[in-house]
């Protein structure tokens, strides 16, 4: 009787050794393929997060590309409206030119002296740049860089005058501290006679001669 | 420590081409306008050309208009001098310069110098 | 173009002595002046620039003046390392344009 218990015992610790086993390998492949799944499933998550990023980027680009066509088609379909014209005002701002408060801007990359930048401005139906506020004065720190910039303000003739005639004692003013100092000790008869940006935006008067960048602007038709 | 260093300096025939190169370290290479000057044999400093910064405006001296181009690569830290047809009277230390601003505020350090010998 | 002119060509002075170099410009040029110290073989050196104003780590025995068309620079009292060629430069406006050069010879 016993040998026979003891047997069928041997034998039950077998098969419930073997269940063991068996269980085991199964609950390894399935957590294998658990973590294969869970691979599989980050892989595409991080593909459908770039797609989705490409996408959006796509899409940013096609609105820049959509916008800048409006833009240019805008403008040129003002040019084209401004040849039938006779031209005594413009009606939209030239190709390079900046557009801000119903004046168009023309931003130098180059250097001339004053009278050269002023007679350039002439030669482009515009004059040197005239500031007549601080809101003015801010968009045209924004795009002329950290360089010294030539404005349509000297004292050439005696007081301080505007290029275009605005008044210059109740207008906007800008000076560095001192400035203007009319410095005469450079000896070219007569002071440091034309205002321009220095890097931080703020006005200096300097001597005339220097190859400083400068600032184009004309009047734009209010009308359109 | 501010250091530019010429290159490509040599003997060349008349007519022929050379092309200089000033590497500069030492200092934010973008923000400054650079230059070349050059000396001739016994004689004293000729300014050759300019550029500012950004590269936006290049000036040269009536010598040499028309015939030499200077660039940058502001990416490289590196000053160019293109020469082309090159003559007798281009016979020189050419030196490059860093301006003490954007490129119109005078010269301040300078490099060794590479030397160019236009000789048949 | 703006000319050039340095006073004298050479010169001949000995250690301890006070020195003036002139320099003349065709125009005015404000304060836009600099000036240069080149020893044989070697690169100029900056001394001064603003027609007065002393480069970083030039000594004080080195000094500017001037504005307009006539510039001098003066070194107090000169020193072995100071025999060199001279030269002033202007860069009010392109081209910029240099001096001939005054050489300082031992006496």
């Known amino acids: 009787q016993n040998s026979k218990l003891r047997g069928e015992l041997q034998a039950l610790r077998e098969t419930f050794s073997n269940f063991t086993a068996s269980t085991e390998v199964e609950v390894k492949a399935l957590s294998s393929q658990g973590g294969n799944v869970g691979r599989k499933m980050k892989s595409l998550e991080s593909q459908l997060e770039k797609q989705q990023k490409d996408l959006s980027e796509d899409h940013s680009d096609l609105l820049l590309h959509v916008k800048q066509f409006v833009s240019d088609l805008r403008s040129l379909s003002c040019q084209i409206a401004a040849l039938h014209g006779n031209g005594s005002t413009l009606t939209c701002c030239p190709v390079n030119w900046l557009e801000y408060e119903g004046s168009c801007y023309w931003f130098s990359r180059s250097g001339k002296s004053w009278p050269e930048a002023d007679k350039y401005c002439q030669l482009e139906s515009a004059h040197l740049v005239v500031v007549n506020s601080r809101e003015e004065q801010k968009f045209i720190q924004h795009h002329m860089g950290p360089v010294n910039t030539w404005m349509g303000l000297t004292d050439q003739s005696g007081p301080w005058k505007w290029v275009d005639g605005t008044d210059y004692e109740t207008g906007f003013k800008n000076w560095r501290p001192e400035q203007p100092d009319d410095w005469y000790g450079h000896g070219l008869g007569g002071g440091e006679d034309c205002a321009h940006f220095t890097d931080d935006g703020r006005w200096n008067d300097d001597v005339c001669q220097r190859p400083y960048r400068w600032v184009c602007e004309a009047a734009r038709d209010p009308a359109t | 420590q501010v250091q530019l260093v010429e290159s490509g300096g040599g003997v060349v025939q008349p007519g022929r081409s050379l092309r200089l190169s000033c590497a500069a370290s030492?200092?934010?290479?973008?923000?400054?306008?650079m230059h070349w000057v050059r000396q001739a044999p016994g004689k004293g400093l000729e300014w050759v050309a300019v550029?500012?910064?950004?590269?936006?405006?290049?000036n040269y001296a009536d010598s040499v208009k028309g015939r030499f181009t200077i660039s940058r690569d502001n990416s490289k830290n590196t000053l160019y001098l293109q020469m082309n047809s090159l003559r007798a009277e281009d016979t020189a230390v050419y030196y490059c310069?860093?301006?003490?601003?954007?490129?119109?505020?005078?010269?301040?350090?300078w490099g060794q110098g590479t030397t160019v010998t236009v000789s048949s | 173009d703006i000319q050039m002119t340095q006073s004298p060509s050479s010169l001949s002075a000995s250690v301890g002595d006070r020195v003036t170099i002139t320099c003349r410009t065709s125009?005015?040029?404000?304060?836009?002046l600099a000036w240069f110290q080149q020893k044989p073989g070697k690169a100029p050196k900056s001394l001064l620039y603003?027609?007065?104003s002393l480069q970083s780590g030039v000594p004080s025995k080195f000094s500017g003046s001037g504005s307009g068309t006539d510039f001098t620079l003066t070194i107090s009292s000169l020193q072995p390392e100071d025999f060199a060629t001279y030269y002033c430069?202007?860069?009010?406006?392109?081209?910029?344009?240099f001096g001939g050069g005054t050489k300082v010879e031992i006496k």
């Open positions: 430069q202007q860069y009010m406006t392109y081209p910029l344009t």
């Open positions: 030492g200092f934010t290479f973008s923000t400054y306008g």
């Open positions: 310069a860093r301006d003490q601003g954007v490129g119109y505020d005078g010269l301040d350090v």
């Open positions: 125009q005015g040029i404000g304060n836009y």
């Open positions: 603003k027609a007065s």
């Open positions: 550029i500012w910064y950004d590269g936006s405006n290049k």
